[in-house]
Every structure is written in structure tokens, then in C-alpha cells.
């Protein structure tokens, strides 16, 4: 028998600084977690201990902290390269700077490989970007080899800014000849990275024979066996055991996300390759292991830079914003109620008469909404806040839309309702009910707009033929987390102003802020 | 574009060792296998073993084991190959290559380095 | 070891004429296989690897085929910078082995 220990991370979204415990900007420092000096502790720590380990990364590095607006990836291939990462997945964020902003800064510059067996490239692009990502990579891990077929969530191109000449293929589709391909090379001991959620990992190891082990990301998913050491309430035992197709026991595993955990998976090969046992539990990185002081000065260094952005307090709260996913893709949340406040502010116009405002409504997706603020911090609000909240540097754009499309979105906002994905809306000048008893496509039960042609605004019932103005992210402008309705039916499409530089700009304004979760979005049973 | 720049010939008496060099350039040296293969006078090729420079992991024919000693040195972006107690049937020349994806045949090729053992 | 076993070992062709080289493995190796091509004095090129995908740049008159044992290299239309000597190998498994070579010739 073999043993292998797959340490792991996923959707750490540049969380290179040890942060709190809702993966918020740390404030304690004794009761912080994660970051990179941190989770370079424990990797060499088990590095040491244990004969043959691969640390592997499944995706979703970009995007997240004020370290990503400014390094734009260079800070993740860095500190990955520092920490010695045997291989990584690309994830859908880590197109957000188009395929440049990813080949420059991170294909360029890994010393590790960087996976996708399902993004094929065409045109012009594919001689450029040869070589730079691989379908699979053989290992050397010790006297053995292991395999590892890298994948890639094909709902990026309505995620991200892949561009045209990235076809994102079938995961399974496209993974299975590339182990086969592993298997032709005598390669028996085979690991699937990739970043397209916990269903479709489970379905990877399911569906694609020889797969032996499924290391996840994308839907931040929390798995583990006994008592959870922190916050994350577990989807399930980790690994979670997935009976394949031709009835082999395979574990599936992701680690949470922000780099707040190192998964942690032992896993024991006979000599054909075959999974004998399987067992670990993600590590939680908290203040009990130190920061690894060669790795945090090198932080301190590159942080030098960061520092004009994240000194400037823009204003204060007296609320916890909650920001996080668990609220803001499940129900009315104040960090988007703020949010939606600020775009409509931003949008004031004054010109006629008849309307006390040419806009009332604003529309954001839950999933935009990437991090609580802690009100704790004497209440600061800064634009580093702002840009974890707030990391994609969007814009709030103007659209004009008939009161069809909108049904439509907020019907497509609870269609797959609880899976924790990002097309929840949070709303300003809107009062929705959704009635979750009744079928995908039906759940909207009341949906009631606040007027704009009126002295005194008030909320009236939404008209199915009528053209409404609405403040929304250029992102599902753009058909972004599968609001195709939008892009295809909007009537007019203005781009407005970035997105932290609208939230700032209000709170600045505003100067002490303290939204409520006050009724805007609301569910009931029964008949309306 | 990638290359891979060999040094230069050398000749050597029998149960002397030889130590080739392999410079890269034009990618990532540390995500791609280098793989040493040589060609005897006049004869066809033979695989000698290869290095994973990500973690100087080596694999050797086991008709080379002992005798060839496979090295890297990333900072300098360069693989070594060294072979001891040389006899006359190891005069030939040495190349150094690299893939595409892993294993599936050798891409980029040294010029090669001719290793005359002679006494 | 596995023992990849070129036939013909010399071939005289002409400008334009259809070549067809073969590789015999000694033991099943899938589609483990590569071909190169090489010239006096010059390091070796790779044609194709897979089998049958065909190496950034190679002309499309080369194409390979075959699977377990018996292996092609197929050129459609011998042109004139195509005379030199032909090696497959095989990667399936270690270690890994090369044909003896076909060197393809001026009729």
C-alpha cells in the first residue's frame, strides 16, 4: 500500500491576510484565521511529518480583497510560488480580468501548473496561451506518479470575462479521454481539481471512470466528520463518499473557502491504484498555528503598497453589515439593502416635474455581495471594506426594462432556491413575496415597485407591459449569473459609475450609516 | 519561444565521469519535465530517464541506474545529467528535451552534445 | 522491456509519392506512441504523439493512426525536405523504448 496526503485549498478569493472569523478584515488579531503565512505553517508542517503530500489548489485565487484590485493576480502567483503549490485549477474568478489580466500576471508567472481539461482555446488566442494551462499534469510524488485532470465550471463565460476565443466544454465530456489518456501512460493513481461546485464534483466522480479522488471548489462547500471546529455547518462527512458508475467508493472533498481551512485528505492506494481507505478533516487555521514569520514579511512588504487604500475612512457604521453568503443569497440582507440605497442615490436626477426621481428600483445579484463589515472596528468603513464587499470593479448601470423581464428575473432569482447561488436579488424600490411551496417559474407571489412619477413614492403592483427604469451591476446587464432575460430584453443599457467608488461615495455622504433588514424581500405560504 | 541550449563537447577517458548541461528558456521551467535521451554513432535513440524540476523528482532506465545522475537548478532555469564510470559504447550524443503534456513525446530538443569516451 | 520494431528499415520514394512507415510493439501500449523525424546532424523533431495528433506546425500531409501494436506514420505527398530518417517510441511504459528508425530516401 501507498499513502498519499492531498492537502487543499479552493476560492481562497485574496485572502492573503489572516482575516476574522466571517472572512472579513481582521480585527483581533488574536482571534484571526487563515492567510498565506499562516497555511505555510501547516503545509511544511505536514510536509515534514509525511512522506508524500501534494498541495493542490482548486480554483478561484482572484478576486476578494483590496490585494486583488491592486496586484491584479501577481500577488497570487507569488505567494503560491512561496508556498510551493504542486498544481491549480482555474476557476471562473480567475477570468476577471479577461484572459490577459490571467495570462500575464498567473500563467506567466506560476512555478506550478496551472489545469483545465474542459477550456479549449480557438483563433488567435491558442497559440499564444499553448502550454501556459494543461489538461492534466503527471506528478512525481515520491517513487509514484499521480495524475491530476484539471476542470473548470462551463457556466464561466456568464461568470466572468473569459472572452470569445475560450470554449468552456461538458466537464465530464472532456475529463474522461484525458484519463484515459493517464491511464494509457500507466498512470493508476488519478485526482480530479476543478471548480464547478459540489454537484458537479460529485457527478465527476460518478460519471468519469478511473477518477480515484474529486478535489472541489466553486461552491464553497464546508464537509466534515465530527464537531466543527469553527462557524461552517457541514454539507456532509469529509470526504464525502461517492459510489461510482462502475461501483468503485470515491471521495469527494472541498475545503469552505478564503483560505480559512487546509483540507486535509489521506488517502491509501494498493498497487493497481485502487482506493483502499480515505480519511482527514479540513484543518482549521486559526490563531493556534503561527504565521510563518519569513511569509508574513514578505506580506508586510508587499502590504506597503495597499496601505493609501486601506487608511482612508470614508465613513462610519453603527450595524454589522452582513455581507455574507449564508444572508445575502437566501434573504433580504443589509449589506445589499446599503448597497441598492447607494446606487439609487447615485442615481438622483431632478429633472421634471412629474418624477421626483427618473429611477426607484435597483436590482443586485447576492452572489456581487462578497463579504460582511464588522461594525466592531470603531465603526470604520474604508475602501478596503468596500472592495472585499465589492471586489469586481463593476459598474451600476442604467437599464430600461418592461415589467415581463423583471417577473422573469425575480422568478429566476428563487428557481433553484437554497443551493446558495449567487442570482438571489437583493432589492431597493422593490417589495417582493415569494411563495417557495410552489413551482420553479411560479414563485413570485406579490411584486410591488415604488413610483417614480409621484410627489410622495409609494409602492404600487408591478405592470407586466410597462417600461421601468433600474439601477442593476453591469454584470447582469451582461446576462451574468444566468439572467439571459435581462440582456436579451433590456430596452436601453446605460453604464454608469464603479461600483465601490458608488457604495463610498454614499457613505461618505451619508457619514453614519446603519441599515436594517426592514421587509423589502419576504416569503409566505399559502394563497395571495 | 521555448529552447533548450546544451554545452559543448567533450571528451572523455574510460571510468571518467561527464556532466552535460541543459540551459532553458521561454517557459516555465519548473512546470515541464526534462527528459535525457542519447543517440550512439550512426544508431538509433535511447531514454535515459527524466527530472521534474517542480520538485527534482527523477525517474531513470534502469540500464542507466547508478550511472546517470539527473540534476536541476531552478534559479538558473538549467538540468544536469551526469554519467560515471564511462566505458567506450557511451560515446554518443546527448540530448536534453521537453514535452508538451506530460510524457506524450519529446517537443523541444537540445542541439545535442557529443561525449567521446576514448582512452 | 518493449521492443518497437520499424519496418521497412529503408525506403526509396519520390516527390509526390504516398509513404507509409510502420511500428510493431512487442506488447499492447494503447496509443502511447510518437513519431519523429531527423536529419543528418540535427536533433530529432516530433511529428506526432497520441498516436495521431499531430505537433504544432507539423504539415498535415504527415498523419499517424493505429492503437495496441501496430502503429503508421503516413505521408500523403513526400516533398522534398521529408527525405530523413523516421523513429517512433513508445511511452506507455518504462522504459520507455524508440523504433530502430527508417530512413526514407531519394529513389
Known amino acids: 500500500a501507498w499513502e498519499l496526503t492531498i492537502l487543499h485549498t479552493n476560492d481562497v478569493h485574496s485572502r492573503l491576510e489572516q482575516t476574522s472569523e466571517d472572512s472579513s478584515k481582521c480585527v483581533n488579531a488574536s482571534r484571526c484565521m487563515g492567510g498565506v503565512a499562516r497555511l505555510f505553517t501547516k503545509v511544511q508542517q505536514i510536509r515534514r511529518a509525511e512522506p508524500n503530500v501534494l498541495l493542490l489548489d482548486a480554483g478561484d485565487q482572484y478576486q476578494g480583497t483590496i490585494w486583488f484590485t491592486v496586484y491584479k493576480g501577481a500577488e497570487v502567483a507569488h505567494f503560491m510560488n512561496a508556498l510551493r503549490y504542486d498544481a491549480m485549477a482555474l476557476g471562473n474568478h480567475e477570468f476577471d480580468n479577461g484572459v490577459e489580466g490571467l495570462i500575464e500576471p498567473l500563467l506567466k508567472e506560476a512555478k506550478f501548473p496551472i489545469l483545465s481539461a474542459n477550456i479549449k482555446a480557438k483563433g488567435p488566442l491558442a497559440s499564444q496561451i499553448s502550454g501556459l494551462y494543461l489538461p492534466y499534469k503527471v506528478l512525481p510524488v515520491g517513487d509514484e506518479v499521480v495524475g491530476i485532470v484539471g476542470y473548470t465550471s462551463k457556466e464561466t463565460p456568464f461568470l466572468s470575462n473569459p472572452g470569445t476565443n475560450l470554449v468552456f466544454e461538458d466537464e465530464i465530456t472532456a475529463l474522461q479521454p484525458e484519463v484515459d489518456k493517464l491511464k494509457t501512460l500507466n498512470v493508476n493513481k488519478i485526482i480530479a481539481l476543478g471548480h464547478s461546485g459540489f454537484e458537479m464534483d460529485k457527478l465527476i466522480a460518478q460519471k468519469v471512470r478511473g477518477v480515484d479522488v474529486v478535489v472541489g471548489g466553486h461552491s464553497n462547500t464546508f464537509l466534515y466528520t465530527g464537531n466543527p471546529p469553527s462557524k461552517e455547518v457541514p454539507a456532509g462527512k469529509y470526504p464525502f463518499i461517492v459510489t461510482s458508475d462502475d461501483g468503485r467508493k470515491v471521495p469527494v472533498v472541498q475545503a469552505y473557502a478564503f483560505g480559512k481551512y487546509l483540507g486535509y485528505l489521506k488517502i491509501e492506494f494498493d498497487e493497481r491504484g485502487n482506493v483502499i481507505s480515505s480519511h482527514g478533516n479540513p484543518i482549521l487555521l486559526n490563531s493556534s498555528i503561527p504565521e510563518d514569520p519569513s511569509i508574513k514579511a514578505d506580506i508586510n512588504k508587499w502590504r506597503i503598497k495597499l496601505d493609501n487604500y486601506s487608511t482612508q475612512e470614508l465613513g462610519k457604521t453603527i450595524v454589522y453589515l452582513d455581507g455574507s453568503s449564508q444572508s445575502c443569497r437566501f434573504r433580504e440582507c443589509n449589506m445589499g439593502n446599503l448597497i441598492c440605497d447607494a446606487m439609487i442615490n447615485n442615481n438622483l436626477r431632478h429633472t421634471d416635474e412629474m418624477f421626483w426621481n427618473h429611477v426607484s428600483m435597483c436590482i443586485l445579484n447576492g452572489g456581487g455581495i462578497r463579504s460582511p463589515i464588522d461594525e466592531r472596528n470603531n465603526g470604520t468603513i474604508t475602501w478596503e471594506n468596500l472592495a472585499a464587499v465589492l471586489p469586481f470593479g463593476g459598474t451600476f448601470d442604467l437599464v430600461q426594462l418592461k415589467g415581463s423581464t423583471l417577473k422573469k428575473a425575480f422568478e429566476h432569482s428563487v428557481h433553484r432556491y437554497g443551493q446558495s447561488t449567487g442570482e438571489f436579488l437583493q432589492v431597493g424600490g422593490i417589495h417582493v413575496v415569494y411563495d417557495l411551496s410552489r413551482k420553479p417559474g411560479d414563485r413570485v407571489v406579490k411584486l410591488d415597485v415604488l413610483c417614480t412619477k409621484c410627489r410622495v413614492p409609494s409602492y404600487d403592483p408591478l405592470k407586466m407591459d410597462e417600461v421601468y427604469k433600474v439601477i442593476l451591476p453591469n454584470f447582469l446587464a451582461n446576462g451574468g449569473d444566468g439572467f439571459q432575460m435581462i440582456k436579451d430584453e433590456l430596452l436601453r443599457h446605460d453604464s454608469g459609475d464603479q461600483d465601490i467608488n458608488v457604495v463610498s461615495t454614499y457613505i461618505s455622504k451619508m457619514k453614519v450609516i446603519y441599515p436594517a433588514v426592514e421587509g423589502r424581500i419576504k416569503f409566505s405560504t399559502g394563497s395571495h | 519561444q521555448v529552447q533548450l541550449v546544451q554545452s559543448g563537447a567533450e571528451v572523455k577517458k574510460p571510468g571518467a565521469s561527464v556532466k552535460v548541461s541543459c540551459k532553458t528558456s521561454g517557459y516555465t521551467f519548473t512546470r515541464y519535465y526534462i527528459y535525457w535521451v542519447r543517440q550512439a554513432p550512426g544508431q538509433g535513440l535511447e531514454w535515459i530517464g527524466w527530472?521534474?524540476?517542480?520538485?527534482?523528482?527523477?525517474k531513470y532506465n534502469e540500464k542507466f541506474k547508478g550511472r546517470a545522475t539527473l540534476t536541476a537548478d531552478t534559479s538558473a532555469s538549467t538540468a544536469y545529467m551526469e554519467l560515471s564510470s564511462l566505458r567506450s559504447e557511451d560515446t554518443a550524443v546527448y540530448y536534453c528535451?521537453?514535452?508538451?503534456?506530460?510524457?506524450?513525446?519529446?517537443?523541444?530538443w537540445g542541439q545535442g552534445t557529443l561525449v567521446t569516451v576514448s582512452s | 522491456d518493449i521492443q518497437m520494431t520499424q519496418s521497412p528499415s529503408f525506403l526509396s520514394a519520390s516527390v509526390g509519392d504516398r509513404v507509409t512507415i510502420t511500428c510493431k510493439a512487442s506488447q499492447g501500449v494503447a496509443t502511447a506512441v510518437a513519431w519523429y523525424q531527423q536529419k543528418p546532424g540535427k536533433s530529432p523533431k516530433l511529428l506526432i504523439y497520441w498516436a495521431s495528433t499531430r505537433h504544432t506546425g507539423v504539415p498535415s500531409r504527415f498523419s499517424g493512426s493505429g492503437s495496441g501494436t501496430e502503429f503508421t506514420l503516413t505521408i500523403s505527398s513526400l516533398q522534398p525536405e521529408d527525405f530523413a530518417t523516421y523513429f517512433c517510441q513508445q511511452y506507455s511504459s518504462y522504459p520507455w523504448t524508440f523504433g530502430q528508425g527508417t530512413k526514407v530516401e531519394i529513389k
Open positions: 527530472i521534474y524540476p517542480g520538485n527534482f523528482n527523477t
Open positions: 528535451a521537453r514535452d508538451v503534456y506530460d510524457y506524450a513525446g519529446f517537443a523541444y
